[in-house]
Interface confidence: low
C-alpha cells in the first residue's frame, strides 16, 4: 500500500496552524479545520484548511495566489459599488468598515428604486435593498447592478440581456445572466457577490425563505373546489391528481454528525408544521443520503398529506441509519426524488402539469462521489417540461431550495442546484446548525395572518364570478329618478371599495344594493363611508361643474361576507397580503410595494366591465412614464371642462389616466363601471391600484360600445397609493396587515 | 437509439409543393421542440423553422415565411414541413433536428433528404 | 450573408492547436449561449459544443469553446485528420427571435 493511503486520518500537525486574533476548531476528525474570528473580522486568507495526503495542511493562498505564512483575522469591509448607472453615490472609498454608510442619488430625469441609503454590516453586506436609477425607458426596468458585481448590457428591451461578474476570488450567487421577459419582469434571481466568509444570518434566511415559499404556496392551483375560509386562513383543497409535493432531502454523510442530523431533523419538523399553518396539505417524500438514499416516505404513500403522520416518520429516523456508508452522493438523493416525481409506463397521470414540486435540501458541503447532482435537477425539469418551450416555460412548478451548513460549503455547488426566480432566493449558507434551527424557528415564529388575497381559481367550467371573484355589483335605486349602477371590488368580509360619486347623500341604505359572487341575492348595507375630502360641487364656483377629487367609498355590510370560490378579497396596496402576493421580503415598505406596482412607466393594467350579462377583463395601460401628461391634458376634452385653464385644477396627483392609442388602443369605461377596480396583475394575484372614476368620452351611449373612439377618450381612476391613510383606518379592524 | 429519419424529398418544378416528415425513435418525441435545417449544395447551414413540443408554437426563417408550414403528430411521432410555392433558391438538403432542452441548439440530427427545384 | 462571421477556412498541421472564430453582435452573441457544430464531409451535423463551453458525451475534450463579449471561439487542441470538417456557430438571436448560424468554417489539417 502507498505511504499516503495507510496514513491515518487526521494525521496533519497542528503546529504553526494558529490564526493571529482568532481561533480554530477541526472538522471531520482532523481532516479539516476551519478558523474563527471575533464578529466583524474575517479569517485571511482563507477560511477552512484540508489535511492533505502528505500529512501537511493545505497551503495559505490568497485569492490571487500568493502564499501566505501565518492566517490572520482581519477587519470585514463591503465591497464598493464597481459601477452606479445614471446617479452619483457617495462617500466613494476603495472600501467600507462595518458600519459606513454610503447614499445614492440619480441624476435628473431618473427615479430611485431601493433604497438611498445603506449601511454595511458585521456579515460584510450592504443593508437594504439594490440602488437603481431608472428612466422607465425599457420594457424591463433597469435591473440594476448589486454592489460588488458587474453588469454587461444596458439595453432593456423584451429579451434583452443582461449578465453580472464577480471579482475573482468572490462566488456570484444567482443568476449569471437575466433576460427582459414579456410582461416586463427579469428571468432569474438578482446576483451578489459572495466571500467564503459570508454567511446568511438566521433573520435574513427566514424572510427570503418565508417569502418565496409563501408564494409557491399561495399560487397553487385547486381545480375542484375550495371550501369556506376558516378564520384567517383559506384551505386550499387539492385536486386528487395532487396539487403540491415537497420533496425533504436531508443529508446523512458522516461529516455532518448526529447532533447536527437532529438539529435538521427539527428544522424540517418546524417547516411541516409552517406549511400546515397555511391551511395547505400537500403531499411530502422523506430523503436521508450518503453514500445511498433512503426513502422514508414517498409521495404516493396515502398518508404523505398528513402532516402529523410525516412528523412521526420523521423524528424516527436515526442517524445510524447511514452509518457504514459515509460518502456523499448528492446525485443518488435526488435521483431518489426523481423516481418519486415519475410515473410508471411513463404514462403522466390526470392533472400531473398542476402539481407543483418543491425540493428543500440541507448539506453540509460537497458531494464527493456519484457525479454531478445537477445533471438530475436537469431530468426533472425535462420530466415536468420546465423550461422547454420559451412562451410557456412552467417556471413556477418546480422550487429548489439548498440549505448549505457550515463552512465546507461549496457556493458554486449549492448556486447551480438552487432555483433561481425574481425576487426570491432559494440557496442559503449558514454558520451551523443553530443559526438552520434558528432559521425556522423564526419562521415558525412568524404568525401573520394569511388571507389570501387576489387569487383567481381557474377552472375549465369557471363562471365570471371565479375569475373575477373579487366583482361586485351595485345599484341604487331612487324612486321616480330611476337608478344608478356601479362596481366595486371586495377588499375585506365586511368592506367593498367602490367610487363616491356612485351615491349621494340623500341615498338610504335600504335603496343600495350589492351583489358578489354572481349571486341573485343582495346583501344588506350597514353604511356607506365617503372619504372627507370628496365634494362633487367642491369647485363649482370656479367654473368647474363636476369635482372628483378622492372619488372613493366604502360600503360596510351587515354580515360578513363567506369566501368562497367565487367570492374573495382583492389585494390592496401597502398591505401584508400584497407583500406576499408580490413574492417581496416581509420588511418590503409601502414604498417598495409602490414602485413594483406603479414604476414611471407605462404599466399594463385591468378593469373588469359588464357587456351583455358577461363580466370580461379589458387591458389598458396606465400612463405613468412620458406620456403621463399628455394623458391628463386630455380631460381639456371633458364636457364642461373645456373653460379649465390650467388642467391640475381638474386632474389632481390623486388620479391615474388610462385610455388613447399608445402603446396601444386601450379600451375605455363606460358609465356603470364606475367604482370598479383597476387592477395590476403581477405574478398570478391580483392588486387593486385604482378606483374607476370619471372618463372624458362616453363611449358607451346607446348601452352599446363603440368601436371607434377618438385618441383623446381617457379615463381617470383614483390612485389607492393616495388614500391610504383613509383606507387603513376605515379597514384597521379587518386584519389586512397595513404597513 | 435515437434517431430521425426525413422522407419525402425529390425532384419538383417551381411553384410546386412537397411535403417532408421525419420519424422519431429512441426518445419521447412529445417532450423536444424540433427544427428544420436546410443546406444548399456547397453552402452553409440555413435554419428554417422550429416548432414547440406540444406543436402549439410555431417559429419561421424569414425567407420561407408564409410558403412553408411545420407541423407533428406526437401520436406517430413525426414532424412535418409542407413547403408550397416552391423556388429555385429553396433547393437543399433538409435536415430534421431535434432541439436541446437547456438551450437553442439541435442535439440530434436526421441523415438528411434532398429537395430539387428544377424547371 | 450570414449576420455571423466565421472565417472561410482554417487550417493546421496534426498536434497542432487551432482556433475558429465567430463574429456577432449584442442581439445574438453578446446576449445569448453558443452553440458549436461540426460536419464531416457527406455527413450530417454534430452538436459540439452547447452553452458556450458545455462538450456533450462523447466529444473528446480536445475541442473547447469559450465566449466574451459578442464573439465566441472554438479551440481544438492535437489536431487530428478526422478533424478536417467544417464547423458552425450558433447563437440564438433576439432581434431575429431565430437561431441564426455562421457562414462555416472549412478546417484542413495539412
Known amino acids: 500500500t502507498p505511504w499516503s493511503l495507510a496514513r491515518p486520518q487526521g494525521s496533519c500537525s497542528l503546529e504553526g496552524v494558529e490564526i493571529k486574533g482568532g481561533s480554530f476548531r477541526l472538522l471531520q476528525e482532523g481532516q479539516a479545520l476551519e478558523y474563527v474570528c471575533p464578529s466583524g473580522f474575517y479569517p485571511y486568507p482563507v477560511q477552512t484548511r484540508t489535511c492533505r495526503s502528505t500529512g501537511s495542511w493545505s497551503t495559505l493562498k490568497t485569492q490571487d495566489q500568493k502564499t501566505v505564512r501565518k492566517a490572520e483575522c482581519r477587519a470585514i469591509h463591503c465591497p464598493r459599488p464597481h459601477d452606479f448607472e445614471n446617479g452619483e453615490y457617495w462617500p466613494r472609498s476603495p472600501y467600507y468598515n462595518v458600519s459606513d454608510e454610503i447614499s445614492f442619488h440619480c441624476y435628473d430625469g431618473y427615479t430611485l428604486r431601493g433604497s438611498a441609503n445603506r449601511t454595511c454590516q458585521v456579515n460584510g453586506r450592504w443593508s437594504g435593498q439594490t440602488a437603481i436609477c431608472d428612466n422607465g425607458a425599457g420594457y424591463c426596468s433597469n435591473p440594476g447592478i448589486p454592489i460588488g458585481t458587474r453588469k454587461v448590457g444596458s439595453q432593456y428591451r423584451l429579451e434583452d440581456s443582461v449578465t453580472y461578474h464577480c471579482s475573482r476570488g468572490l462566488t456570484l450567487r444567482g443568476s449569471q445572466r437575466r433576460t427582459c421577459q414579456e410582461g416586463g419582469s427579469w428571468s432569474g434571481t438578482e446576483p451578489s457577490c459572495q466571500d467564503s466568509f459570508m454567511y446568511d444570518t438566521p433573520q435574513e434566511v427566514a424572510e427570503a425563505f418565508l417569502s418565496s415559499l409563501t408564494e409557491t404556496i399561495e399560487g397553487v392551483d385547486a381545480e375542484d373546489g375550495h371550501g369556506p375560509g376558516e378564520q384567517q386562513k383559506r384551505k386550499i383543497v387539492l385536486d386528487p391528481s395532487g396539487s403540491m409535493n415537497i420533496y425533504l432531502v436531508l443529508d446523512g454523510s458522516d461529516s455532518i454528525g448526529a447532533s447536527n442530523f437532529t438539529g435538521a431533523k427539527k428544522c424540517l419538523v418546524n417547516l411541516i408544521e409552517k406549511v400546515a399553518s397555511y391551511g395547505v396539505k400537500p403531499r411530502y417524500g422523506l430523503v436521508t443520503y450518503a453514500t445511498y438514499p433512503k426513502i422514508w416516505v414517498k409521495v404516493s404513500e396515502a398518508d404523505s398529506s398528513n402532516a402529523d403522520w410525516v412528523t412521526k416518520q420523521l423524528n424516527e429516523i436515526n442517524y445510524e441509519d447511514h452509518k457504514l456508508k459515509s460518502g456523499t452522493n448528492t446525485k443518488k438523493a435526488l435521483q431518489a426524488v426523481y423516481s418519486m416525481m415519475s410515473w410508471p409506463d411513463d404514462v403522466p397521470p390526470e392533472g400531473w402539469n398542476r402539481t407543483r414540486h418543491v425540493i428543500i435540501l440541507m448539506t453540509d458541503g460537497l458531494h464527493n462521489m456519484g457525479g454531478d447532482p445537477i445533471t438530475v435537477i436537469d431530468e426533472i425539469r425535462d420530466l415536468l417540461y420546465i423550461g422547454k418551450d420559451r412562451k410557456n416555460p412552467r417556471e413556477d412548478y418546480l422550487d429548489v431550495y439548498v440549505f448549505g451548513v457550515g463552512p465546507l460549503v461549496n457556493q458554486v455547488n449549492i448556486n447551480a442546484l438552487a432555483s433561481k426566480k425574481d425576487n426570491e432566493q432559494h440557496v442559503f449558507k449558514v454558520k451551523d446548525m443553530e443559526n438552520l434551527e434558528d432559521v425556522f424557528y423564526q419562521m415558525i415564529d412568524e404568525s401573520q395572518s394569511l388571507s389570501l388575497c387576489g387569487m383567481v381559481w381557474e377552472h375549465r367550467k369557471g363562471t365570471d364570478y371565479h375569475k373575477q371573484p373579487w366583482q361586485a355589483k351595485i345599484s341604487v335605486i331612487r324612486p321616480s329618478k330611476g337608478h344608478e349602477s356601479c362596481m366595486g371590488a371586495v377588499v375585506s368580509e365586511y368592506f367593498v371599495l367602490t367610487a363616491a360619486h356612485c351615491f349621494t347623500v340623500d341615498d338610504k341604505e335600504h335603496s343600495i344594493k350589492v351583489s358578489v359572487g354572481g349571486e341573485k341575492r343582495d346583501l344588506e348595507i350597514e353604511v356607506v363611508l365617503f372619504h372627507p375630502n370628496y365634494n362633487i360641487n367642491g369647485k363649482k364656483e370656479a367654473g368647474i361643474p363636476e369635482f372628483y377629487d378622492y372619488d372613493v367609498a366604502l360600503i360596510k355590510l351587515k354580515n360578513k361576507l363567506k369566501y368562497g370560490q367565487t367570492i374573495r378579497p382583492i389585494c390592496l396596496p401597502c398591505t401584508e397580503g400584497t407583500t406576499r402576493a408580490l413574492r417581496l421580503p416581509p420588511t418590503t415598505t409601502c414604498q417598495q410595494q409602490k414602485e413594483e406596482l406603479l414604476p414611471a412607466q407605462d404599466i399594463k393594467a385591468l378593469f373588469v366591465s359588464e357587456e351583455e350579462k358577461k363580466l370580461t377583463r379589458k387591458e389598458v395601460y396606465i400612463k405613468n412614464g412620458d406620456k403621463k401628461g399628455s394623458c391628463e391634458r386630455d380631460a381639456q376634452y371633458a364636457p364642461g371642462y373645456d373653460k379649465v385653464k390650467d388642467i391640475s385644477e381638474v386632474v389632481t396627483p390623486r388620479f391615474l389616466c388610462t385610455g388613447g392609442v399608445s402603446p396601444y388602443a386601450d379600451p375605455n369605461t363606460c358609465r356603470g363601471d364606475s367604482g370598479g377596480p383597476l387592477i395590476v396583475h403581477k405574478r398570478s394575484r391580483f392588486i387593486q391600484v385604482g378606483v374607476i372614476s370619471w372618463g372624458v368620452v362616453d363611449v358607451c351611449k346607446n348601452q352599446k360600445r363603440q368601436k371607434q373612439v377618438p385618441a383623446h377618450a381617457r379615463d381617470f381612476h383614483i390612485n389607492l397609493f393616495q388614500v391610504l391613510p383613509w383606507l387603513k383606518e376605515k379597514l384597521q379592524d379587518e386584519d389586512l396587515g397595513f404597513l | 437509439e435515437v434517431q430521425l429519419l426525413e422522407s419525402g424529398g425529390g425532384l419538383v418544378q417551381p411553384g410546386g409543393s412537397l411535403r417532408l416528415s421525419c420519424a422519431a425513435s429512441g426518445f419521447t418525441f412529445s417532450k423536444h421542440s424540433m427544427n428544420w435545417v436546410r443546406q444548399a449544395p456547397g453552402k452553409g447551414l440555413e435554419w428554417v423553422a422550429t416548432v414547440s413540443y406540444d406543436g402549439n408554437y410555431k417559429y419561421y426563417a424569414d425567407s420561407v415565411k408564409g410558403r412553408f408550414t411545420i407541423s407533428r403528430d406526437n401520436s406517430k411521432n413525426t414532424l412535418y414541413l409542407q413547403m408550397n410555392s416552391l423556388r429555385a433558391e429553396d433547393t437543399a438538403v433538409y435536415y430534421c433536428?431535434?432541439?436541446?432542452?437547456?438551450?437553442?441548439?439541435?442535439?440530434?440530427w436526421g441523415q438528411g433528404t434532398l429537395v430539387t427545384v428544377s424547371s | 450573408q450570414s449576420v455571423l462571421t466565421q472565417p472561410p477556412s482554417a487550417s493546421g498541421t496534426p498536434g497542432q492547436r487551432v482556433t475558429i472564430s465567430c463574429t456577432g453582435s449584442s442581439s445574438n452573441i453578446g446576449n445569448n449561449a453558443v452553440n458549436w457544430y461540426q460536419q464531416l464531409p457527406g455527413t450530417a451535423p454534430k452538436l459540439l459544443i452547447y452553452?458556450?463551453?458545455q462538450r456533450p458525451s462523447g466529444v473528446p475534450d480536445r475541442f473547447s469553446g469559450s465566449k466574451s463579449g459578442t464573439s465566441a471561439s472554438l479551440a481544438i487542441s492535437g489536431l487530428r485528420s478526422e478533424d478536417e470538417a467544417d464547423y458552425y456557430c450558433q447563437p440564438y438571436d433576439d432581434s431575429l427571435s431565430s437561431v441564426v448560424f455562421g457562414g462555416g468554417t472549412k478546417l484542413t489539417v495539412l
Open positions: 433536428a431535434r432541439e436541446g432542452y437547456y438551450y437553442y441548439g439541435m442535439d440530434v
Open positions: 452553452n458556450n463551453n
